[in-house]
């Protein structure tokens, strides 16, 4: 489970916390009495903010209110203004801008083309029985499995736009129903948030920067996880997304078949027909369950055909029966001739890559699937790089002016909603939420943007990314436009629903508090950031995937007890913090659990020992290795042989954060551990408290 911060009233400084502390008590204790408590003593303690009881046991106090890690540091703007450029600089800048615009349009074109090819690839990969497989198989009828497929695919392709486009292509190819696609879209929303979390790891060198950056990145994760946690069961029960989007799409009155608008296909067809062409007649025959079509290849071979009013007739007993002497032959077994029925004589082959390969449909489809995915990802990356280079320098100034400034009272509350619009707009421009949020992450880390302001920007980004899905829908052929547009709208309304759940009322902004809690833990135990990433984006989805494939019985058998334990822990946690007196004394805190179950300190010792031998070798390599080492072992002093780690060590020495005085502790076990009375981890692996 993700670390769960205190769910009570938000305090001005929620990072002043005790990790692994007991439940909060309403009355303040006598400090002198508290220091004399034994391990098993249960007594009222000071009301303070808490992180989950199973998080780290080490206690830190931020130096002063001025040095609050969640406060923004002073920033210096960089970037040459237009007015400050000389004539040569202005001309160069202008032509660079034109060049970037051309490149941008080019990559956008190939992006749309790759969507078209992706649709063809799914038709080929799906093969003759694809429709039945996707509509009947457990993979598509199990929403939980759909969800984790969405997460894993998006984690692998590093873009929700790409995985959403895949789903849209599958829907437009009729390989997937809208209902089955919705959980995949939800999973894609979760998966895309890994990108900016990875970006946040790059700021591991500076503890306070890392705290802010990691929290800023994981606010996206928590929003998506919480949204799915609530909305997936709601969707499974009510199908509200499917119903709403169906009503909207039907109100557009799209025509089916040939008369439907091809829109982007008009400009993409000249390119896509050079890659692959499908025999539309075979596709329609398969759709109508034509048995003869099952042995036919979907890849179009002959484009130029001569239509003659004759047809091959295998029933000619001998060549003497030929209707036309010149159009008569044998294949050694049967005699053929042309009858007075339309017959297409193949004259010229199609001019596409796969025309002469004679590969099975599955092979062609797989090749195209991989290539179109690569092009999709590549185009998205290049679009972002181009836009990134355009925005570089001026982005900090623009963001600080537009985002961190509140409207005057009484309209201050509207600022967040403007931030949502800005986030949506920016993502609409860059065509990728992961890119926009990844750009935000270092800005949060260095203090350009507060987490409170980054949160609505991220939510807006989730809305903005749906425009890519709408683009994908518009690239679908006319008769598939409705279904693909519907799935794009499902993505849109899912994000809207999530915003309505976790934004309008300040109390419901759980993702901020959860992200800050995780930021604090990861700043203290930096290896936990990697652990979190692996658990939430790989292990949990893969476990659910495995259990789902094993069947509903296995999934329920394992899932129900796990969910029950989680709910039990949460309820107990809530009671401990709200009304501990209703609980038996033993359950008023977590001391009844062994230390490894309620603190990260023992785990830290294990990780430190495990990475001990790796640290010295790794740190001597380069700055990147050093940062990776420091992330894992949380110990810059272990890297003395590396100049970069010495620099880090020196920088940290001037910023050491004092450990809280034992009299403020609400738990003697933790108090003693901090003072060294209780055996903790090996001191050799603990170089510094922070």
């Amino acid at each position: 489970m993700a670390p769960w911060p205190e769910l009570g009233d938000a305090q001005p400084n929620p990072d002043k916390y005790l990790e692994g502390a007991a439940g909060q008590q309403p009355t303040a204790p006598d400090k002198s009495k508290e220091t004399n408590k034994t391990d098993n003593t249960e007594a009222p303690v000071t009301k303070i903010e808490l992180l989950p009881s199973y998080s780290t046991a080490t206690l830190i106090d931020e130096p002063t209110e001025v040095d609050d890690p969640w406060n923004l540091p002073t920033l210096q703007d960089s970037g040459i203004k237009w007015s400050e450029r000389d004539t040569k600089g202005k001309i160069l800048c202008f032509f660079q801008g034109i060049g970037r615009l051309i490149l941008l349009l080019g990559f956008l074109y190939f992006f749309v083309c790759s969507l078209d090819i992706l649709s063809s690839a799914f038709q080929l990969v799906g093969g003759k029985m694809a429709g039945q497989f996707f509509s009947n198989s457990s993979i598509m009828s199990n929403p939980l499995l759909g969800l984790v497929i969405g997460v894993l695919v998006t984690v692998l392709v590093q873009s929700s736009s790409t995985s959403t486009s895949i789903v849209v292509s599958m829907v437009s190819s009729s390989l997937l129903t809208v209902r089955a696609a919705i959980p995949i879209i939800m999973g894609a929303n979760i998966g895309t948030s890994i990108t900016n979390t990875i970006v946040a790891l790059m700021q591991v060198g500076d503890r306070s920067e890392f705290r802010r950056a990691f929290a800023g990145a994981t606010v996206h994760d928590f929003f998506n996880w919480l949204s799915v946690l609530v909305l997936l069961p709601v969707e499974v029960a009510t199908h509200y997304l499917e119903i709403i989007t169906q009503l909207i799409v039907e109100s557009f009155h799209f025509k089916n078949g040939e008369d439907a608008p091809d829109l982007l296909k008009v400009i993409t067809k000249p390119f896509t027909k050079l890659i692959v062409q499908l025999d539309k007649k075979v596709i329609s025959q398969i759709a109508m369950n034509d048995e003869k079509a099952k042995n036919k290849s979907l890849v179009k071979i002959w484009c130029k055909t001569f239509t003659n009013k004759t047809q091959i007739n295998v029933t000619v007993p001998s060549t003497a029966n030929c209707t036309s002497p010149s159009l008569c032959w044998t294949d050694g077994i049967q005699n053929w001739t042309m009858k007075n029925v339309t017959y297409k004589e193949n004259i010229a082959k199609c001019q596409h890559i796969f025309v002469n390969f004679h590969l099975p449909d599955l092979a062609v489809g797989t090749i195209l699937l991989i290539l179109s995915l690569l092009v999709l990802c590549g185009c998205l990356i290049m679009i972002v790089k181009i836009l990134g280079s355009v925005l570089k320098g001026q982005v900090a100034t623009v963001i600080k002016k537009t985002i961190n400034t509140d409207f005057p009272f009484p309209f201050a509350w509207l600022t967040g909603y403007l931030a949502i619009l800005v986030g949506a707009g920016m993502t609409f421009i860059v065509q990728s939420s992961s890119v926009f949020t990844s750009a935000l992450t270092p800005l949060i880390g260095i203090g350009v943007i507060t987490i409170e302001r980054a949160y609505p920007l991220t939510l807006g980004s989730n809305i903005g990314t749906t425009t890519t899905a709408i683009l994908a829908a518009l690239a679908s052929p006319g008769n598939a436009l409705r279904s693909s547009l519907q799935i794009a709208l499902c993505h849109f309304f899912f994000n809207i629903s999530g915003i309505l759940l976790w934004y309008p009322i300040p109390f419901t902004r759980l993702p901020i508090r959860m992200a800050k809690g995780l930021g604090n833990i990861s700043a203290k135990y930096r290896w936990f950031a990697v652990f979190y990433l692996i658990i939430f984006f790989f292990l949990i989805p893969l476990t659910v995937f495995g259990l789902s494939l094993a069947g509903w019985r296995v999934l329920v058998g394992v899932g129900v007890p796990v969910v029950f334990i989680i709910i039990l822990v949460l309820c107990l946690r809530l009671l401990q913090s709200r009304c501990p007196r209703v609980l038996p004394k033993k359950l008023q805190n977590w001391n009844f659990l062994p230390l490894w179950m309620r603190s990260l300190k023992p785990w830290d010792a294990v990780v430190s020992k495990f990475t001990g031998c790796f640290q010295m070798r790794c740190c001597c390599c380069c700055r990147v290795c050093c940062r990776a080492c420091c992330l894992l072992c949380d110990c810059p002093k272990c890297c003395r042989c590396s100049k970069c780690c010495e620099d880090l060590e020196e920088a940290q020495e001037g910023q050491d954060v004092p450990v809280k005085a034992p009299e403020t502790f609400d738990n003697i076990t933790i108090s003693r551990e901090a003072q060294g009375e209780v055996p903790a981890s090996d001191s050799k692996t603990e170089c510094t408290a922070l």
């Epitope: 295998v314 002497p325 010149s326 008569c328 032959w329 294949d331 050694g332 053929w336 193949n346």
Partner: antibody, heavy 120, light 107 residues
Amino acid sequence: QVQLVQSGAEVKKPGSSVKVSCKASGFFFTEYIIHWVRQAPGQGLEWMGGIIPNNDVTNYKQNFRGRVTITADESTSTAYMELSSLRSEDTAVYYCARWRNAYYSAMDSWGQGTTVTVSS
Amino acid sequence: DIQVTQSPSSLSTSVGDRVTITCTASQDVGTAVAWYQQKPGKSPKLLIYWASTRHTGVPERFTGSGSGTDFTLTISSVQPEDVATYFCQQYRTSPLTFGVGTKVEIK
């Protein structure tokens, strides 16, 4: 790519029989006719017969009827040619070749050939 | 059975020369004629089908023509790699029959 891989060379005694296999890959086996053609040393090509794998319809050249049997196994995409009552004049290289069913494109791909030597 | 006669049985030419091989069927075969190339020690390869349609990947220097009973294969500019035996085949009626072959050599 399109491949027709034939079995190895055989040395047989007169009166015995030989079975040559031809494994197809890189195309839809059932969409093609598999023909067998032989070439005696220093001679031209002689068509022996063929089979349509998806319905097992066969046809043989008159002078081979009763002596040759052509079969096909769809599951393994393999065609077989069995020639019985071997004589010394049956010493030749035996080729399998494919022909697109319902097309007049002739034998567009051939196997590498199997040398059958008949000697006492 | 339709008899297919090929001429000449062999010919010697120089690189760059134009070569014409003829094939005569004992009866009208329409355009149901194919041409094959067999290099020494190799299996035959299809060059031309339906009398004049060049098979995929066949160089443009190879052209086929004719209908009825008389057919020709022309190599417009002979290359060293064209050293082979060329066979014509009729597929108007069963059994399929081949010509005896024309061996092309380079001087």
